[in-house]
């Protein structure tokens, strides 16, 4: 079995303010078991946008049903985009751990740019 890769096919996405952004992410393997998380930015100051395992993220929905067998699509939609949402978003695969899951592999990132609403 080849090692899992996290694929973010879009280097950049442009969305108008007030619209919904779709950030695409797929994994290439079911192994290792563990959740996906999305972050804005990289490094220790990165901001958690979505965590499959736990948390409440009212503006975020997953494109696919994550409970369905063989699912490897971890794309998300972020609603009601504002200029403050601009940045680079990373889809990160975690490996099941004890007691805590461990970061395994990150996608290359997708830069979200926000176009102001025409006045």
């Amino acid at each position: 079995e080849e090692e899992l890769q996290v694929i973010q096919p879009d280097k950049s996405v442009l969305v108008a303010a007030g619209e919904t952004a779709t950030l695409r992410c797929t994994a290439t393997s079911l192994i290792p078991v563990g959740p996906i998380q999305w972050f804005r930015g990289a490094g220790p100051g990165r901001e958690l946008i979505y965590n499959q395992k736990e948390g409440h993220f009212p503006r975020v929905t997953t494109v696919s049903d994550l409970t369905k067998r063989n699912n490897m699509d971890f794309s998300i939609r972020i609603s009601n985009i504002t200029p403050a949402d601009a940045g680079t978003y990373y889809c990160v695969k975690f490996r099941k751990g004890s007691p805590d899951d461990v970061e395994f592999k990150s996608g290359a990132g997708t830069e979200l740019s926000v176009r102001a609403k025409p006045s």
């Epitope: 079995e1 079911l30 192994i31 563990g34 499959q52 395992k53 994550l66 409970t67 063989n70 099941k96």
Partner: antibody
């Protein structure tokens, strides 16, 4: 930390019903399947059924299809397994288990609930 | 339905020796590039614990003396050097279709 806390031991008469509960914590309840498995005294493991709390999709072992019902209460992150028309050979420890990878496997287990059926 | 048959039903192995448990499926459990076999360890009075998923992948925290192998219909759980704490009943499970378990193999120390 994922935890599955099951209800206490039950003693039932033949022909009665039992409803075992499994309260989940440490993860988003609607993102992962819950399985139910039983083990008669000194015997092996027997899969009963599974439920997706996000949409209540269920799959049953044909042996239990007419007597078992799985439900969930997403407001309390609790799964339930009701077994009807109890017989003495239903005496067993009943386990709930969470499937962390949507692989139809059992990653995290409750401690079990002993159901004794005796006249 | 796919039936899993484990062998042997019980075995006794000396400390430090290799223990091998087999699981045979009545038809192939391979699908979508994966072998849908899982191994569990159950100690007395405890719930089962997942050891191996998708035939050969160790679960989190499982010592590397445990390994899984096989493809299609024949699978093996190997403990390379038996420790006292490995005394337990071991079960295989498939999920090629709806899950079923093997009958279990009781592992004891010789």
């Amino acid at each position: 930390q994922v935890q599955l806390v099951q209800s206490g031991a039950e003693v039932k008469k033949p022909g009665a019903s039992v409803k075992v509960s499994c309260k989940a914590s440490g993860y988003t309840f609607t993102n992962y399947w819950i399985n139910w498995v039983r083990q008669a005294p000194g015997q092996g493991l027997e899969w009963i059924a599974m439920i997706d709390p996000s949409d209540s999709e269920t799959h049953y072992n044909q042996i239990f299809k007419d007597r078992a019902t799985l439900t969930t209460d997403t407001s309390t992150s609790t799964a339930y397994m009701e077994l009807r028309s109890l017989r003495s050979d239903d005496t067993a420890v009943y386990y709930c288990a969470m499937d962390y990878g949507s692989l139809y496997a059992m990653d995290y287990w409750g401690r079990g609930t002993l159901v004794t059926v005796s006249s | 339905d796919i039936v899993l048959t484990q062998s042997p039903d019980s075995l006794a192995v000396s400390l430090g020796e290799r223990a091998t448990i087999n699981c045979r499926a009545s038809q192939s459990v391979r699908s979508s590039g994966y072998n849908w076999i899982f191994w569990y360890q159950q100690k007395p009075g405890q719930p089962p614990k997942l050891l191996i998923y998708l035939a050969s992948n160790r679960d989190s925290g499982v010592p590397d003396r445990f390994s899984g192998s096989g493809s299609g219909t024949d699978f093996t759980l190997t403990i390379s050097s038996l420790q006292a704490e490995d005394v337990a009943v071991y079960y295989c499970q498939h999920s090629r279709e709806l899950p079923t378990f093997g009958q279990g193999t009781k592992l004891e120390i010789k």
